[in-house]
Structure formats: C-alpha cells, structure tokens
C-alpha cells in the first residue's frame, strides 16, 4: 500500500498521535466477539483514556455529544468515544483511512483465523458510516505479513 507517511504528511501524523483509537479497537472486538457468540466473558471494559484531560490539557472531552445513535449496551460507550475520535479525521479522508489502517494493524495479532479477520475488516469499513461520517474511498485494510515495523 502507498506509504503517505514517507511523503511527510505531518498534520495527519499529528492527528494520529493525538487520537485515542483504543475505544474503536475495543468496540470492534466486542462487536465481532458478540456476533460470533463464542466468548463467555468480554475481557474489555470501560477504561481510562490514556490521553485523558488530566494528562493532556489540550485533549477534548471524549464524552462530548456525537452524531450517531447509541446501539448495544455493552460497547455503546466505546462506540461513542470512538466516533468522537474519528470525527477529527472527517475533513481529511486520507488521514481517516490511515486511522482505520492503524486500528486494523493494532488488532491484527488478536484476530483468530481468516474468518474473524474478514469480519473485523468488514466492521471497520462500516465504522465511519456508523458514526455518521464519510467513509474514505479506496482504503486498503490489508495487513502485510512481516510485523509492525515493516515500514
């Protein structure tokens, strides 16, 4: 896939550094595990934002109103926080794509088998729409073999 980061898109990199993509990862993992109905206990639970206002004064409140409907009690909090984060990429579709690629990459180790990987990818593609945001066109979510530092 094309490596925009090598072209020096510093503004996007800054956005990605400040974003907290964990709620998105947690929401999606919960969703596919719920759909599979094969996990007894969900290991994810609401947690402190690693970039919470107390640690980073310039961070916005992750619980501010968001433009989508709440669905599914278990991960609605994660979804709301996730949508707040993705909303920051609304005006930069290439950066939105990179955020989605980052979520995919972060979770790739955890996905068990091709089927779960495809399901995660499907849910990830739908995520911007679920948040009432535009989905980026032509966003490659394939994770190449070779690990996280292949760049």
């Amino acid at each position: 896939r094309q490596q925009w980061e090598l072209q020096g898109d510093r503004r996007c990199q800054s956005q990605l550094e400040r974003a907290n993509l964990r709620p998105c990862e947690q929401h999606l993992m919960q969703k596919i595990q719920r759909d599979e109905d094969s996990y007894g206990r969900d290991p994810y639970s609401p947690s402190q934002d690693p970039y919470s206002p107390s640690q980073d004064p310039d961070r916005r409140d992750p619980y501010s109103p968001s433009p989508y409907d709440r669905r599914g009690a278990g991960s609605s909090q994660h979804q709301e926080r996730c949508c707040n984060e993705l909303n920051e990429f609304e005006n930069n579709q290439r950066c939105m794509c990179e955020a989605l690629q980052q979520i995919m990459e972060n979770q790739s180790d955890r996905l068990q088998g091709r089927q779960q990987e495809q399901q995660f990818k499907r849910e990830l593609r739908n995520l911007p729409q679920q948040c009432g945001l535009r989905a980026p066109q032509r966003c490659d979510l394939e994770v190449e073999s070779g690990g996280r530092d292949r760049y």
Epitope: Q13, S14, Q48
Partner: antibody
Framework: VQLVESGGGLVQPGGSLRLSCTAS????????MSWVRQAPGKGLEWVSS????????KYTDSVKGRFTISRDNSKTTVYLQMKSLRAEDTAFYFC???????????????WGQGTLVTVSS | TQSPSSLSASVGDRVTITCQAS??????LSWYQQIPGKAPKLLIS???FLQAGVPSRFSGSGSGTDFTFTITNLQPEDVATYYC?????????FGGGTKVEIR
C-alpha cells in the same frame, strides 16, 4: 531494528548529561520512543516518552522539570537531556521503541543495550 | 504489585507469576524477560498475546486488575527476571520483577 545508546558516564550531583539513542532498521519518524532506567540491581522504571513528531512528551513525576526528551528525525536519534542530577538518578538508561506507530499507547518491542549514568561526588 | 519477588524451580516445572494492578487496566499489560546483563525483551502483550518467535511455553492471562504469567516446562535458558508493565495510562509502571532461578 537496532537501538544504540550513548552519552552515559560519571557526573557530580547537580550536574548535567545528555544521552543519545540512535535508531536504524525502521521508519524512525512515525514511531514513539521512550527512555526506561534501571538502578543497579533494581527493577525497571519508565522515565519519559516522545511521539514521532515530537509534539507529545510524557515524564515520570520524579524527573519533571529536570529531564527533557527530544528527537531529531533527520538523524534518527532521540535524546534525554538530564539536569540537576541526583544520586538517585544513577542507573542504566535504556531507550525503547513503541510497538505501534504514531501512538504512545502500546508496549515496547525493541530495546537498546543501555548506557550507565553514575551520579556521585 | 508483582509476586513473588523471586522463586526457584526445577527444569520441567510449571512456574506462575502474578501481577495485580491498583486500578482496572482492561488487558493493557505486557510481560518482559530480562536475562542478566541484557536488555528487556517483550514476551507478551495485551495480557495474553505471545510475540512472534517467543516459545509457546510462555503464556499470560487475566484482565481488569489480576494477571498471571506462566512458564510451563521451565528450561535453563529461562533463568531471568520477569516484569509486568501496564500501558493503560501514564505514567507507565512496571512491576517489581520476579527473579526465576533453577534449583
């Protein structure tokens, strides 16, 4: 992936020292980097982290105001400027790479071999 | 809080180390191995996910505040100090370490 620390040595209490960590084998500018220290015979202590752009920095309370983390992406090097050094800062200082690009939110997947800082009169 | 601080076991034994967090860290916990005189090495991330190339005799489990690290079939090359580390928030904190020796 290779991380090589340098700049350690003997310094008097109240003195200053600048540690460097030069990286190779990965796209340095998109990964967060950290410093972790280990007093001789003791456990590991996280000291500081910096994001790829250098815009986000974090410090453990005991070094705030005394240590400054910075990076030069053109030289693929991260620095730790240490001032007002105390005896309790004596330790091996390791630099470590974030496992995941962009964010300071995941574990360290590669570490350097460390450089010894001794603060003594 | 990591315990025990040290342990001695025989080759082939099963060794268990625990790590207790002071607050809920979901599964944002890693385990590192530090062989004397060497840099730490990441073995497990996200509480239970083994890093590529790490032998399957190492395993981790837990979520919330209670975590366990296990070595099944202890080998002489496993002599090291093992550390847990939370990365849920800053400051990132390490457990006190567990020194594993062969008796």
């Amino acid at each position: 992936v290779q991380l090589v620390e340098s700049g350690g040595g003997l310094v008097q209490p109240g003195g200053s020292l600048r540690l460097s960590c030069t990286a190779s084998g990965f796209t340095f500018s998109i990964f967060g980097m950290s410093w972790v220290r280990q007093a001789p015979g003791k456990g590991l202590e996280w000291v500081s982290s910096i994001s790829g752009t250098g815009e986000i920095t974090k410090y453990t309370d005991s070094v705030k105001g005394r240590f400054t983390i910075s990076r030069d992406n053109s030289k693929t090097t991260v620095y730790l400027q240490m001032k007002s050094l105390r005896a309790e800062d004596t330790a091996f200082y390791f630099c470590a790479k974030e496992r995941t690009k962009y964010q300071l939110a995941y574990p360290f997947d590669y570490w350097g071999q460390g450089t010894l800082v001794t603060v003594s009169s | 809080t990591q315990s025990p601080s040290s342990l001695s076991a025989s080759v082939g034994d099963r060794v268990t180390i625990t790590c207790q967090a002071s607050q809920d860290i979901t599964t944002y916990l890693s385990w590192y191995q530090q062989i004397p005189g060497k840099a730490p090495k990441l073995l497990i991330s996200d509480a239970s996910f083994l890093q590529a190339g790490v032998p399957s005799r190492f395993s981790g489990s837990g979520s919330g505040t209670d975590f366990t690290f296990t070595i099944t079939n202890l080998q002489p090359e496993d002599v090291a100090t093992y550390y847990c580390q939370q990365y849920e928030n800053f400051p990132r904190t390490f457990g006190g370490g567990t020194k594993v020796e062969i008796r």
